[in-house]
């Protein structure tokens, strides 16, 4: 059946002619008010002159995704403004393919290739102009737009400088071969932010890595500030759709944040999976294992489909400060499997943190070193001391009786007591390593409901210092 689009346009299935009519290139000049006439068209040089297109400057193409509303959404205008503010001489072009995107999702997917071809033809034409270089082109695509950018990069004659995929769409792209989705082959540097990946239901964002570096903020799934309770506060009804939009669109806002909050850059750390990152294992910057996110991401050699992780705040600025904590729990008797709840408070030269929970990803290893990830929203400065609390309530009579019996048979230490001599801390952002020791080496034990204080006793862990992200990425 021949399907008609609103406004009488045919779908992309009817070929490039239809796409040509359905794709517009709106050149957003920062020179004065927005001019309606600044639409670029292959073969028409006048708009380039009229609207002061700078051939030697960076050129950004912003590509929206599938839309139910049929209108350009607010995020796009914010992104345009942020780019213009950060790169004052740059050209910013909005690829408007609304007539093809404002369809059933599946039909919009089937139009992505032909829209990508349309973008490639625009780039091919611009390459014929003096001073224009594909190396200066940065395609930024959100959701379906990320795959459009991929197709454009694939079809263009030459290699585009950079493609940023902002939560590339998942349905109909997950698991397909590289020629049918965004891939590292589509530009000299492809960086991707994944903010809505789900293993249950349908994953709106693609789960698989599709770039040179693939960054998964907060594990790529539950974004802070996007829970049903959070969206309930801002709308009449907190619905799943609001959560989906919040989490999917978070990729855009993280990118905008990287443009406007230059003084608060966020860093991501290479890791094989989210669980290992949650354990605090992956906070290294050696061998390019950390990178800036969003606009501040840097191309590193020989990286492809590299997964990177970070935690973020619930809103702008999104930056947090990551710390790896290594704690060796000594247990003087067999206490079986215990599941303690520990909290830490970090005290620094600038501020003290909130009470932070130590997330136990698997199980506490007794008589073993356990690694934890904690993060703070504020810059604490140089760490001075740490308070560790073992959450616990007053025990039942049965617990007390068991403890008393245990004491009779082994009158040394109560059951469910652990000993901790030191805490080793590494800052993700500065890569500094510090060791914190108990004040009195004789008083190292902690039981439920108790706290233990640790004071900085050594710079480093008696290990070679690593480079910090600020040094590496400057």
């Amino acid at each position: 059946a021949e399907e008609q689009l609103e406004g009488g346009l045919r779908t992309a299935k009817d070929g490039p002619a239809a796409a040509k009519a359905a794709v517009r290139f709106h050149f957003r000049t920062s020179k004065g008010p927005e001019r309606e006439g600044c639409y670029l068209s292959v073969g028409h040089s006048q708009p380039l002159e009229d609207c002061s297109f700078n051939m030697t400057a960076k050129t950004f193409f912003i590509i929206h995704g599938w839309t139910m509303s049929g209108m350009l959404e607010n995020w796009l205008h914010k992104l345009v403004s942020a780019l213009q503010m950060r790169e004052k001489d740059a050209n910013v072009v909005v690829v408007d393919w609304l007539p093809l995107a404002h369809q059933l999702y599946t039909d919009a997917v089937n139009s992505t290739r032909v829209v990508g071809l349309s973008v490639a033809k625009m780039l091919d034409w611009l390459q014929g102009k003096d001073g224009f270089s594909l190396g200066n082109v940065h395609l930024i695509g959100y959701s379906l737009g990320a795959h459009v950018a991929g197709f454009a990069g694939n079809f263009v004659k030459g290699t585009v400088g950079r493609i940023t995929g902002l939560d590339p769409a998942g349905p109909m792209f997950e698991g397909v071969d590289i020629h049918r989705r965004l891939s590292p082959d589509d530009a000299d540097f492809v960086d991707v932010l994944h903010t809505y990946t789900r293993s249950f239901g349908i994953s709106i964002g693609i789960q698989m890595p599709v770039g040179h570096i693939d960054i998964y903020p907060n594990g790529g799934d539950f974004q802070p500030g996007c829970g049903l309770n959070d969206v309930l506060g801002s709308i009449a009804y907190g619905t799943i759709a609001e959560v989906v939009k919040c989490e999917h669109e978070r990729a855009v806002h993280l990118f905008v944040d990287s443009l406007v909050n230059q003084d608060k850059p966020s860093f991501a750390f290479q890791c094989t999976d989210s669980n290992r990152f949650k354990k605090g294992i992956c906070l290294s910057c050696r061998k390019n294992r950390c990178n800036g996110i969003g606009y501040n991401a840097k191309k590193t050699r020989n990286k492809r489909n590299t997964k990177m992780y970070l935690k973020t705040r619930a809103g702008m600025p999104f930056r947090v400060y990551h710390y790896q904590m290594k704690i060796h729990f000594f247990s003087y008797k067999s206490v079986g499997a215990i599941e303690p709840t520990f909290y830490v408070t970090l005290y620094g030269t600038n501020a003290e943190s909130q009470v932070l929970s130590l997330e136990i990803v698997e199980q506490i290893g007794l008589n073993a070193t356990n690694t934890f990830l904690v993060y703070t929203e504020e810059d604490l400065g140089d760490l001075l001391k740490i308070k560790l609390t073992w959450e616990g309530t007053s025990r039942s009579w049965y617990d007390l009786w068991r403890e008393f019996r245990s004491y009779l048979s082994q009158p040394h230490r109560p059951e469910r007591e652990l000993s901790i001599r030191r805490i080793r801390v590494k800052s993700g952002e500065t890569q500094r390593r510090l060791t914190f020791c108990v004040e009195d080496p004789e008083k190292t034990s902690i039981a439920p409901g108790q706290e233990l204080w640790f004071y900085k006793c050594r710079d480093g862990w008696r290990m070679k210092n690593e480079t910090s992200p600020t040094v590496e990425l400057s």
Epitope: A1, E3, E6, M68, S69, G70, M71, H102, L104, Y105, T106, D107, P171, M172, I202, I204, I235, A236, Y237, T239, A241, E242, V244
Partner: antibody, heavy 119, light 107 residues
Amino acid sequence: QVQLQQSGAELVKPGASVRLSCKASGYTFTKYTIHWVKQRSGQGLEWIGWFYPGSDSIKYNEKFKDKATLTADKSSRTVYMELSRLTSEDSAVYFCARHEEYTNSLAYWGQGTLVTVSA
Amino acid sequence: DIQMTQTTSSLSASLGDRVTISCRASQDISNYLNWYQQQPDGTVKLLIYYTSRLHSGVPSRFSGSGSGTDYSLTISNLEQEDIATYFCQQGYTLPWTFGGGTNLEIK
């Protein structure tokens, strides 16, 4: 919780028109598309079209584009379907249902409105 | 338009049985296949979306599978409340189309 409340049964004469309503509650009305589906007695389901209150966007099944007209009143959170030039072929139960984006499924359905066309 | 075919229009089974209902599309629908249950009182409910994803509140005895053009719905342990008519629907392209339905009865 999400609810779609449809208007009551209608007995109409051939050649006349009828307007069915579907009142939505329990979610942000402008965020979801409402679809209409026809079921003739003892038969299968036929998709009529959709209405998206967020931008008044409408899509029709080619088969129904001269039969059905979809509109909405945002203030009352209600979507309407008007059926014109009724014949006995239009005698059926008409359902409204809410579209789930990306999955292209109809997650919540109204209880249905029976339309009987008879002289 | 994409044709959806449910070859079995009626099916008898005993309580506790494992029941499978099939559905075929006239072309590849990329897993955009949904299953609905219509109860005897006419109430329609979504059971499975996107081939295999269970809609919230649907018992885990319902499951879906398939790819390309062939899909199926399985009820692992038939209960009395499952007696109903089951429809498949493709959401791959407009117009959306439904299968003719499979009426499930007790033996």
